[in-house]
């Protein structure tokens, strides 16, 4: 053995293995990654843990382990096992964890696993299993966790699962399952987590999930579903549902009516065109709802009873109006993204007191009333670009003390109210051709970035000094997560991921040079100095 000192080597430690005593004077034996082709023969009866993973073991003789009545965990992962005979695990009365992943099993052993009464966790993933014998799991009354992912199953082994009434988590992901039959999991009333992602599932029996009364997490991501999985309606405890990356084209009315506990629904990367207006009603735990490009949606969804929603993204649809009482339904909303719709008029959003980010770019909005954004004390970012806004009420932005980013680019503005905007760090007004007046820089003591319709308007902001990567800075804080919006922003924005690091450092260096001067574009530049621009302005 290779334990600390020569005197400390416990008796019954196979050569080259690493052994130590656990707190109960039982032996933990690590024989992993030693190039073994067979099981060590002189194992102590008092072994509680045996790791034989990452070796070259191709056979498990029926009698070698039967004396290890204290063995609780047996690791045989990453070997060359193609078959496990009946009796291989006989006598392992204390066995709780059995790891057989990354071997070459073509079927679950027919009898070797039966009646391991203490077994709680069984890993059979990453083999070549295409067949699960009907009675292979019989007698596994304590089994809680079963891994069968990354195998070659074409069907759910319905009969084999009938004896696993204590099972709490199971993964059948990364197989070749094409259909789930009615009552496929009918006896798994304790199952909490079921992973079916990365299969070839194209159809679900209407009652395929019946019996899963404890299920909280269901993952159907990366399959070939053409229709919404209506079979979820009996899953009254479901909290997390994933069916992203399928081929689902519509979400029906009252789609989640049987799932009032849903907290998270992932359904992106589906060609969803239509969503029933009542689909997301009465989901009191739902925090985030994101739907992009559902071009057949014309009406804002009914969200009665979904009052804890914090982030709502409904982009690329044909929504032309919002309900007047939208904020009565959504008092906890922090992020509202309705970009790329057909909104013309906006109701008052003042009831959405927690709003931090609003994105309404690419709509048909023509006017911002005084009441629209009143008293949104937490609002930090407001994007109204690419609309038809010609009129903004003088006090439209007067009660937005946290606002630091305002984008009004590509509208029809001829004037711009500055009341209440003294905290802005970013302002975009480019593309408003009728906006010709100079905006006094004194109104924006915190401003870092500004984009104006014309170069001469930058002169008020010391515009000749810097050329700057403005668009990069503008978007730096636009992470969609609500948590990102909580982070305090001192003009230098959070690095979202490692790819941004280089840009961030360059910008940081530029900031240090510029100190607190405003970066304004389009910059007058050396060939159009401010003096020249002011001259032509005065002549004009």
């Amino acid at each position: 053995g290779s334990s600390p000192g020569p005197d400390a080597i416990p008796r019954g430690c196979p050569s080259h293995c690493h052994c130590e005593l656990d707190g109960r004077m039982l032996l933990r034996v690590d024989c992993s990654d030693l190039g073994l082709s067979e099981l060590p023969s002189n194992l102590s009866v008092f072994t509680s843990y045996l790791d034989l993973s990452m070796n070259n073991i191709s056979q498990l003789p029926a009698s070698l382990l039967h004396r290890l009545c204290f063995l609780e965990e047996l690791r045989l992962a990453g070997n060359a096992l193609t078959h496990i005979p009946k009796g291989a695990f006989t006598g392992l009365h204390s066995l709780k964890v059995l790891m057989l992943q990354n071997n070459q099993l073509r079927q679950v052993p027919e009898e070797a696993l039966q009646n391991l009464r203490s077994l709680q966790s069984l890993r059979l993933d990453a083999n070549h299993i295409s067949y699960v014998p009907p009675s292979c799991f019989s007698g596994l009354h304590s089994l809680r966790h079963l891994w069968l992912d990354d195998n070659a199953l074409t069907d759910v082994p319905v009969q084999a699962f009938r004896s696993l009434s204590a099972l709490q988590a199971m993964t059948l992901a990364l197989n070749k399952i094409h259909h789930i039959a009615d009552y496929a999991f009918g006896n798994l009333s304790s199952l909490v987590v079921l992973h079916l992602h990365n299969n070839r599932i194209h159809s679900l029996g209407k009652k395929c999930f019946d019996g899963l009364h404890s299920l909280e997490t269901l993952d159907l991501n990366y399959n070939n579903l053409d229709e919404f999985p209506t079979a979820i309606k009996t899953l009254s405890n479901l909290k997390e549902l994933g069916f992203h990356s399928n081929n689902i084209r519509s979400i029906p009315e009252r789609a989640f009516v049987g799932n009032p506990s849903l907290i998270t629904i992932h359904f992106y990367d589906n060609p969803i065109q239509f969503v029933g207006v009542s689909a997301f009603q009465h989901l009191p735990e739902l925090r985030t709802l994101t739907l992009n490009g559902a071009s057949h949606i014309t009406e804002f969804p009914h969200l009665t009873g979904t009052a804890t929603l914090e982030s709502l993204t409904l982009t690329g649809a044909k929504i032309s109006s919002l309900p007047q009482a939208v904020c009565d339904q959504l008092p906890n909303l922090q992020v509202l993204d309705l970009s790329y719709n057909l909104l013309e008029d906006l109701p008052s959003l003042s009831g959405c007191q927690k709003l931090q980010k609003i994105d309404l770019r690419h709509n048909e909005i023509y006017e911002i009333k005084g009441s629209t954004f009143q008293q949104l004390f937490n609002l930090r970012s407001l994007n109204l670009a690419w609309n038809k806004i010609a009129i903004i009420h003088p006090n439209a932005f007067s009660t937005l003390p946290s606002l630091i980013k305002l984008d009004l680019s590509s509208n029809l503005l001829s004037s711009f109210p500055v009341t209440g905007l003294h905290g802005l760090t970013h302002l975009k007004l480019t593309g408003n051709r009728a906006l010709q007046s100079l905006i006094p820089s004194a109104n924006f003591p915190e401003l870092k970035i500004i984009e104006m319709p014309s170069a001469y308007q930058c002169c008020a902001f010391g515009g000749c000094e810097n050329v700057y990567k403005i668009s990069n800075q503008w978007n730096k804080d636009d992470g969609n997560s609500v948590d990102d919006l909580h982070k305090k922003d001192a003009g230098l924005f959070q690095v979202q991921d490692e790819r941004d690091l280089e840009d961030f450092l360059l910008d940081f260096e530029e900031d240090l040079k510029a100190l607190h001067s405003v970066q304004c574009s389009p910059s007058p530049g050396p060939f159009k100095p401010c003096e020249h621009l002011f001259g032509s302005w005065l002549i004009r």
């Epitope: 319905v158 009969q159 009615d182 019946d210 009364h213 309606k233 009996t234 009254s236 009252r254 049987g258």
Partner: antibody, heavy 118, light 111 residues
């Protein structure tokens, strides 16, 4: 414990409609299908159809599609069957039952007797 | 529709003896290894009571003298030994396919 309580005996005239109720207690109402079964002396048991309470999911035996309509009210945990254009052949005992283990009917209401006579 | 034919129509059994009831389906009711056949007991003036589900699984609370067997199209309900309380009509039912159907019933009398 699980119980299904049905409404009482109904005496109706031909051509009329009747609505029979089935109130469920003791389990998560919306998680199990409710089945409706008709029993006439000498005709055995006939499956009318099923409803998943609270949802729009229903299934009808083709034979009863015109005759029966199911509905549910989750606020009172009650399922209903409406039978219309009543004839003498509709006289029977109507049972609601819960679709339990693998769709077997594990709990039954006590039955509602419908008598159609002029 | 799947037709379930029960036999015999009636059966008289002595106390302590074995009663065997047969149910034959017009087509297989097996799916992925499960046989979607169930057995019920009905006494006069009462609703049916579930005894056996999926051909051979005893419903909780049902005495072990009841047992079920069979697959595909041929199924059997056995009561062994019969007790006085077992006098009733017994029905098989399939839910493999809509519309779900019942057998015509077997009336068991105790001699």
């Amino acid at each position: 414990q699980v119980q299904l309580q049905q409404s009482g005996t109904e005496l109706m005239k031909p051509g009329a409609s009747v609505k029979i109720s089935c109130k469920a207690t003791g389990y998560t109402f919306s998680a199990y299908w409710i089945e409706w079964i008709k029993q006439r002396p000498g005709h055995g048991l006939e499956w009318i159809g099923e409803i998943l309470p609270g949802s729009d999911s229903t299934d009808y035996n083709e034979k009863f599609k015109v005759k029966a309509t199911f509905s549910s009210d989750t606020s009172s945990n009650t399922v209903y069957i409406q039978l219309n254009s009543l004839t003498y052949e509709d006289s029977a005992v109507y049972y609601c039952a819960r679709g339990g283990h693998y769709g077997s009917l594990d709990y039954w209401g006590q039955g509602t007797t419908l008598k159609v006579s002029s | 529709n799947i037709v379930l034919t029960q036999s015999p129509a009636s059966l008289a059994v002595s106390l302590g003896q074995r009663a065997t009831i047969s149910c034959r389906a017009s087509e297989s009711v097996d799916n992925y290894g499960n046989s979607f056949m169930h057995w019920y007991q009905q006494k006069p003036g009462q609703p049916p009571k579930l005894l056996i589900y999926l051909a051979s699984n005893l419903e909780s609370g049902v005495p072990a003298r009841f047992s079920g067997s069979g697959s595909r199209t041929d199924f059997t309900l056995t009561i062994d030994p019969v007790e006085a309380d077992d006098a009733a009509t017994y029905y098989c039912q399939q839910n493999y396919e809509d519309p779900f159907t019942f057998g015509s019933g077997t009336k068991v009398e105790i001699k």
